[in-house]
Amino acid sequence: MAVTACQGLGFVVSLIGIAGIIAATCMDQWSTQDLYNNPVTAVFNYQGLWRSCVRESSGFTECRGYFTLLGLPAMLQAVRALMIVGIVLGAIGLLVSIFALKCIRIGSMEDSAKANMTLTSGIMFIVSGLCAIAGVSVFANMLVTNFWMSTANMYTGMGGMVQTVQTRYTFGAALFVGWVAGGLTLIGGVMMCIACRGLAPEETNYKAVSYHASGHSVAYKPGGFKASTGFGSNTKNKKIYDGGARTEDEVQSYPSKHDYV
């Protein structure tokens, strides 16, 4: 039961994380205008990975896409790449993990196959989360560098009477969404990897030993039960005889609306 719970929770956490990574990637507020020097601005600027926007006091908002590819900073391109890689890996991970879920039956898939798929999706989630965290952190570092550079520029070259206010940018909401989402995806991936350990059957073959009891003899054959490192009695056991009793996971062995082929 604990394995199913760990796997299911890992899947849900990763799903939320990847949704967050997608949301962060699409958001326009990666960097927002710093209002420290002008808290009563009537024009508010903010920028995303794909476009920059201006919101006026009037309520009018105008966004312009970055229609150039070569003219963009290499760091921005790198952040875009990291976020897209994170999304792609996460999406593939989700697809794989759906089929790996213990509560979903696909034909006669072995536990070992499910364990492998769970591990694969877990690793994908971990890499996806790391990509998102790395992407957001690179962008944040870029912002901090630019912030202090523009601050230095603000106090130089003001010899004339006319002041030119340079727009400085600070962390936008998307950065926090990205960090949290990346973290969730990472946690979800770790949970999937932990669940994999519970799913993986360890083939331990014991040598046949004959016990001679007085009256009659019973031979215990090897491989009767598969040894398991699972949490409790949740792992599926091979039956020695086909009795009336079934394990919890074997109750629905016939096709149903819950099965995925």
Epitope: Q33, N38, V40, T41, A42, V43, N45, Q47, S52, C53, V54, E56, S57, S58, G59, F60, E62, R64, V162, Q163, T164, V165, Q166, T167
Partner: antibody, heavy 118, light 113 residues
């Protein structure tokens, strides 16, 4: 047709209070940022206050800060300017205006005259 | 606060002639985010409320005759009437729309010579 109609002006003694109203029609009032601008007799234009679309943000000229309060009632399509502790220098024609692209004021009311005198 | 200074204070131009009004701001009104200048021009005729002529320094408001043009960037702006008509007699104001408090120029009175 867009219309802005101010009311509530009149003669008031220094230190007194007055509440100006601006009835808006011909447009979706709740979707626009609104402002008050005043013009003293024979003088230029002076921005007084602005209230953002939702009403959550308000901005005031330094000369009226702490004395004037701008508010809006979107259900009644009405903009208000509550003026307290009035001074002689507040004597002016008060215009209600609508903000559009570029934070420009595209529509102005006919104005209401406020006279502060003893 | 951004200070707006208009020049000249008054201007007399013959009918059909070009009229030029200047406006200077103490701070740049150019927004780096969209490369637009947050300055508007208004025309006020005697006994009437002001009328918007231009926003974003050079974008003409609908219904404004094309003899009017707005130009400039940063801190220096110009309103030009290419061929003055009798109905253009009015006081013209420039306004900072970039940051609060919104400030107006002192106005330029345009008359016919």
């Amino acid at each position: 047709e867009v219309q802005l109609l101010e009311s509530g002006g009149g003669l008031v003694q220094p230190g007194g209070s007055l509440r100006l109203s601006c009835a808006a029609s011909g447009f979706t009032f709740s979707s626009y940022t609104m402002s008050w601008v005043r013009q003293a007799p024979g003088k230029g234009l002076e921005w007084v206050a602005t209230i953002i679309i939702g009403g959550s943000y308000t901005y005031y000229a330094d000369s009226v800060k702490g004395r004037f309060t701008i508010s809006r009632d979107n259900s009644k399509n009405t903009l208000y300017l509550q003026m307290n502790s009035l001074r002689a220098e507040d004597t002016a024609v008060y215009y209600c205006t609508r903000l559009v692209k570029g934070n420009a004021m595209d529509y102005w009311g006919q104005g209401t005259l406020v006279t502060v005198s003893s | 606060d951004i200070v707006m200074t208009q020049s000249p204070d008054s201007l007399a131009v013959s009918l059909g002639e070009r009229a030029t009004i200047n406006c200077k701001s103490s701070q740049s009104l150019l927004n780096s985010g969209n490369q637009k200048n947050y300055l508007s021009w208004y025309q006020q005729k005697p006994g009437q409320p002001p009328k918007l002529l231009f926003y974003w320094a050079s974008t003409r408001e609908s219904g404004v005759p094309d003899r009017f043009s707005g130009s400039g960037s940063g801190t220096d702006f110009t309103l030009t009437i290419s061929s003055l008509q009798a109905e253009d007699v009015a006081v013209y104001y420039c306004q900072n729309d970039y940051s609060y408090p919104f400030t107006f120029g002192q106005g330029t009175k345009l008359e016919i010579k």
